[in-house]
Amino acid sequence: TQQSQHPTDALSEDLLSIIANMSGCLPYMLPPKCPNTCLANKYRPITGACNNRDHPRWGASNTALARWLPPVYEDGFSQPRGWNPGFLYNGFPLPPVREVTRHVIQVSNEVVTDDDRYSDLLMAWGQYIDHDIAFTPQSTSKAAFGGGADCQMTCENQNPCFPIQLPEEARPAAGTACLPFYRSSAACGTGDQGALFGNLSTANPRQQMNGLTSFLDASTVYGSSPALERQLRNWTSAEGLLRVHARLRDSGRAYLPFVPPRAPAACAPEPGIPGETRGPCFLAGDGRASEVPSLTALHTLWLREHNRLAAALKALNAHWSADAVYQEARKVVGALHQIITLRDYIPRILGPEAFQQYVGPYEGYDSTANPTVSNVFSTAAFRFGHATIHPLVRRLDASFQEHPDLPGLWLHQAFFSPWTLLRGGGLDPLIRGLLARPAKLQVQDQLMNEELTERLFVLSNSSTLDLASINLQRGRDHGLPGYNEWREFCGLPRLETPADLSTAIASRSVADKILDLYKHPDNIDVWLGGLAENFLPRARTGPLFACLIGKQMKALRDGDWFWWENSHVFTDAQRRELEKHSLSRVICDNTGLTRVPMDAFQVGKFPEDFESCDSITGMNLEAWRETFPQDDKCGFPESVENGDFVHCEESGRRVLVYSCRHGYELQGREQLTCTQEGWDFQPPLCKDVNECADGAHPPCHASARCRNTKGGFQCLCADPYELGDDGRTCVDSGRLPR
């Protein structure tokens, strides 16, 4: 069912351009052009495209999620399951998702069973990694081609709205009949959009997009698009650093920068600022970095780790350009993400037997393995972690006790709140809480706390939301087949009778409630069915999710040309060093903690289960020291003023790939090869670009005057205005007459 032919590949570029003007689809339709430079083989492209040259879209950002089973839509190609309340499945209507939440999933905040084995960091890592590999964009509040409903205002199923209906007896005082729900955007030319291509049929059902690269590539740190990557990098440093917060520091350590002022302010404002209803969110490789403090903490940790590695690599290889340092540090950070996920995280989730069965040892790159994240994985299976989220944010002092000044916060108090970190003692108290406090154990009759089902808060929304109902509704929106179809897909027996269900779900009351609601086992939503299953031995998922997560992880590993264990990616010495590293070491290197557990995912008591950072092994970067052969005619490459070069090899010959620093453009040859006579061409030149002359994308806001400088530009403000944090907008300096 995994197609390599894109639905639009057969169309001419002229026709595509016409359609693009109507639909905005062009960027996603044109097959990516894969550069044939040795650099393309050395560092992964930011979009994930061209990882597999036979299937350049596999795993790339802004492509459709993979289908492991065909979707099930009510009209055969686009309408979600449950769209028409009278539509019967196996003789019964599907239960409203909110009813399922209320009767099966939701428990009060006080009902939490602590995981006796794993720390809250295990939960946080799962969410963080999910945000590395998948983000499904939603339709905007208006449908793409006019006439669309505003989903905040309607309780009718009217594209792009698929509201979550509330039962009459359980509506808030205001009497709202529904919770808003926006359908995920259709991949270009699928479902209803097939009409544009004359292909409105069940053979071209609605597909959903992944806005991120599927690959485990630390896109949480670096982004999944060139535009975002540009925003994230510090272009003035010679060390290939990432941008950090310009003003605020955490005991000398960096914070994430804020989004630029031009971006919509979608987070909670700084406390004590009168009249402010919203403030900026953190800027990171994934837009959800401010969602919850645990997620912000990991984004911050890896920003620091990149900058630490970049500085160390530059000190080791002074001849490296800023770009080379950036790419090498990015490569190491990406490898660490892969190692921590596949070596430390996934085996805990699947259990050793299922890990062996579905993932197994690495046997090298497989060009037939499609690494594209599957719809069922991102929409259902990997959302198992929502049932492990503790309703409290715990912040601990240096003795790993409840912090006297920083009491535990209910989760809803910390949603989209950068100031929880910035004004809450910084990163260390949060990291201590994640290390030394247990995750919530996923128990069949305690699946999700009210913090997530009653008080989930998004500033763009007028009311609170319900994560459990959203997950169920999202599965239906995406046309995911039911629980039994997926069990069959995984080679597990279908569950036909209540007794069958009781073998999979030990809690008789939960199994009975599920059947009371769904009436037929085939109708059970896959997220709920998988979530409620008994855990496999030494696992935190049941057999269905272990299968789906395992298959996905194997595909992400085996189908990734840049996987850290693939022989061309690192030297043997570098691989040996990388293996020594761990999340505990990353914490030691980038926080004020001096004692950590040897295994960051194992919940431990302080101090007895904590080790001194001195005894936590890590990689020795000596393995990254670059030396040049003394016997070739080329010698040390010539540097180019205002430009960089990166070394790579092609057919056993040294190659230099030049690039110009930000604000300069290349003139001459981009790539030089070492021959027996020396370099085959003269190095190129880097000429200054006059950014101020760019009328299409003016670098300064209209409030500022632009002045060209060598390699850049300056935005100037007239008194009494001053330059804002973004360096482009003039803001009130506080001296304007009131």
Epitope: N90, G91, E496, T497
Partner: antibody, heavy 119, light 107 residues
Framework: QVKLLESGAEVKKPGASVKVSCKAS????????MHWVRQAPGQGLEWIGW????????RFAQKFQGRVTMTSDTSINTVYMELSGLRFDDTAVYYC????????????WGQGTTVTVSS | ELVMTQSPSSLSASEGDTVTITCRAS??????SNWYQQQPGKAPKLLIS???TLQSGVPSRFSGSGSGTHFTLTINSLQPGDFATYYC????????TFCQGTKLEIK
């Protein structure tokens, strides 16, 4: 309305096979399990097994395993139950009955097919 | 296999009486029991599903209760057409066993 129409009475010799049909009308045939139940003269009801017509999946009582086959032809909304290796004690009325799920009561029954095994 | 035991196996009553038939399961079957009525020479008719859900068209004098291992069928104010054989059945686990039946006769 919902109806199940079974094939006519059969007389078979021991060791032979019998194939009984059950044609459904008045409902979405594929969405409902079809069960087969038999009743020997003067005895109680005995469940033989079920078929899920849309998938062709079946489940049988252990007693009939290996002797019974259930199939469906969705184009004509018909299910079949074949019992092989007939014995004298297989003499019974064979009913098809439908239910919206495997475990809710059988709410619609066929009129029954009398199968007599005699030499 | 799950065993269903019904009592009594036969019962005599008069028009207007109330009768109760009980059924025991050999293990917990939650509420997955059904009750059928069978007139001589006819196919069985479903009266009650899921222990207590009355089928449409079935008179309200019939009622079912119970869960776990113990279930009852109660018929209030017996009518002439109620004299028949009654079967309970479990649909919790396969095979879906019936009990031996209770023959309700006119006294």
């Amino acid at each position: 309305q919902v109806k199940l129409l079974e094939s006519g009475a059969e007389v078979k010799k021991p060791g032979a096979s019998v194939k009984v049909s059950c044609k459904a009308s008045g409902y979405t045939f594929t969405g409902h399990y079809m069960h087969w139940v038999r009743q020997a003269p003067g005895q109680g009801l005995e469940w033989i097994g079920w078929i899920s017509p849309n998938r062709g999946a079946t489940r049988f009582a252990q007693k009939f395993q290996g002797r019974v086959t259930m199939t469906s032809d969705t184009s004509i909304n018909t299910v079949y139950m074949e019992l092989s290796g007939l014995r004298f004690d297989d003499t019974a009325v064979y009913y098809c009955a439908t239910t919206r799920t495997a475990y809710y009561g059988m709410d619609v029954w066929g009129q029954g097919t009398t199968v007599t095994v005699s030499s | 296999e799950l065993v269903m035991t019904q009592s009594p196996s036969s019962l005599s009553a008069s028009e207007g009486d109330t009768v109760t038939i009980t059924c025991r399961a050999s293990e917990n079957i939650s509420r997955y029991s059904n009750w059928y009525q069978q007139q001589p020479g006819k196919a069985p008719k479903l009266l009650i599903s899921a222990a207590s859900t009355l089928q449409s068209g079935v008179p309200s004098r019939f009622s079912g209760s119970g869960s776990g291992t113990h279930f009852t069928l109660t018929i209030n104010s017996l009518q002439p057409g109620d004299f028949a054989t009654y079967y309970c059945q479990q649909t919790y686990s396969s095979p879906f066993t019936f009990c031996q039946g209770t023959k309700l006769e006119i006294k």
